[in-house]
């Protein structure tokens, strides 16, 4: 004979756990249904009635199967230095990430709490380590034979041009100027 399928709520066998998408209710002492993502528990189960679920209200969400009585509030709207990479829905929180030219100075579980502009290396300095989503640009002085004449968060130090005859020697912030030979 096939084993009987237990319908929630049911008392679990001693030593056994509730099935997937069920939870053990310590008051009812029963295995009861969880609510699906996008829902929350409106009425907890009893010994004879299963969990009653309801949809999350606007600007709230649940991402997992759950038995919480209230959905979580979506995070506040993205600030002007951020872009919304994931909208707030009943099943997921809003995710804000930093817009181009900015990095995340203070992260949160998902997305970024505080963005900051990427450092710009001034003339005479080039990018030693590029900025990432979560780290700032690192600048370094241009080594002899290299230069950077821009204020930039992306430009590296470039080699001076090689002249047959140098008119003006290059330095850290300026390229060498070559003498042009007339024909």
């Amino acid at each position: 004979l096939p084993a009987q399928v237990a319908f929630t709520p049911y008392a679990p066998e001693p030593g056994s756990t509730c099935r997937l998408r069920e939870y053990y209710d310590q008051t009812a002492q029963m295995c009861c249904s969880k609510c699906s993502p996008g829902q929350h528990a409106k009425v907890f189960c009893t010994k004879t009635s299963d969990t009653v679920c309801d949809s999350c209200e606007d600007s709230t969400y649940t991402q997992l199967w759950n038995w919480v009585p209230e959905c979580l509030s979506c995070g506040s709207r993205c600030s002007s230095d951020q872009v919304e990479t994931q909208a707030c829905t009943r099943e997921q929180n809003r995710i804000c990430t930093c817009r181009p030219g900015w990095y995340c100075a203070l992260s949160k579980q998902e997305g970024c709490r505080l963005c900051a502009p990427l450092r710009k290396c001034r003339p005479g300095f080039g990018v030693a380590r590029p900025g990432t989503e979560t780290s700032d640009v690192v600048c370094k002085p241009c080594a002899p034979g290299t230069f950077s004449n821009t204020t930039s968060s992306t430009d590296i130090c470039r080699p001076h041009q090689i002249c047959n005859v140098v008119a003006i020697p290059g330095n850290a912030s300026m390229d060498a100027v070559c003498t042009s030979t007339s024909p």
Epitope: Q26, T27, A28, K42, V43, K47, S49, V52, P69, E70
Partner: antibody
Framework: QVTLKESGPTLVKPTQTLTLTCTFS??????????VGWIRQPPGKALEWLAH???????YYNPALKSRLTITKDTSKNQVVLTMTNMDPVDTATYYC???????????WGQGTTVTVSS | DIQMTQSPSSLSASVGDRVTITCKAS??????IAWYQHKPGKVPKLLIH???TLQPGVPSRFSGSGSGSDYTLTISSLQPEDVATYYC????????FGGGTKVEIK
């Protein structure tokens, strides 16, 4: 408007059985998620949960008092009745009934009724 | 059974003071805690449920926080009308009240 009112004897003798009735309005115990519970407060002491009954007749009792308590409901009369056997002077208290929400906290309380146990 | 240890049992503070009442459960109660205000001769009034959800009509100076087994009720600026006894109620496993905190004005 949700209201609850407790009624019953103000004085009972030791060993007697106490019967308290909670009559309520503004909600129905046939509505999904509704429940009514009893709480008491001895003079100068803290609140103590006694028993609870749900819309589907599921019942819960304070484990320390379970053997002495019985809770029943009459949905048509909008009433919940609590009986407590073998009363003792330490059971002297104000007895409250309160509505319980589907997520299990008491949101509206009755005014309470004072019961004295004395010979 | 879950025990709820509420502290302090009484306190006296000045109008405008920040007042904090704590309840410690004997096990994790998954945020299933409510707070009640009980004034002499009056009915207990629900202030907060599910740790931090304020009941409609309750002044915003009342707030709740906590998780696991430790929970707090805070009155950000004590008012004369806040004189009462405050109780926590855990409803994670059956129902248990804390011992109460009597709040008075200095």
């Amino acid at each position: 408007q949700v209201t609850l009112k407790e009624s019953g004897p103000t004085l009972v003798k030791p060993t007697q059985t106490l019967t308290l009735t909670c009559t309520f309005s503004g909600f129905s115990l046939s509505t999904l998620g509704m429940g009514v519970g009893w709480i008491r407060q001895p003079p100068g002491k803290a609140l103590e949960w006694l028993a609870h009954i749900w819309w589907d007749a599921d019942k819960y009792y304070n484990p320390a008092l379970k053997s002495r308590l019985t809770i029943t409901k009459d949905t048509s009369k909008n009433q919940v009745v609590l009986t407590m056997t073998n009363m003792d002077p330490v059971d002297t208290a104000t007895y409250y009934c309160a509505r319980m929400t589907g997520t299990r906290y008491f949101d509206v309380w009755g005014q309470g009724t004072t019961v004295t146990v004395s010979s | 059974d879950i025990q709820m240890t509420q502290s302090p049992s009484s306190l006296s503070a000045s109008v405008g003071d920040r007042v904090t009442i704590t309840c410690k459960a004997s096990q994790n109660i998954n945020k299933f805690i409510a707070w009640y205000q009980h004034k002499p001769g009056k009915v207990p009034k629900l202030l907060i449920h599910y740790t931090s959800t304020l009941q409609p009509g309750v002044p915003s100076r009342f707030s709740g926080s906590g998780s696991g087994s430790d929970y707090t009720l805070t009155i950000s600026s004590l008012q004369p009308e806040d004189v009462a006894t405050y109780y926590c109620l855990q409803y994670g496993v059956l129902w248990t009240f804390g011992g109460g905190t009597k709040v008075e004005i200095k």
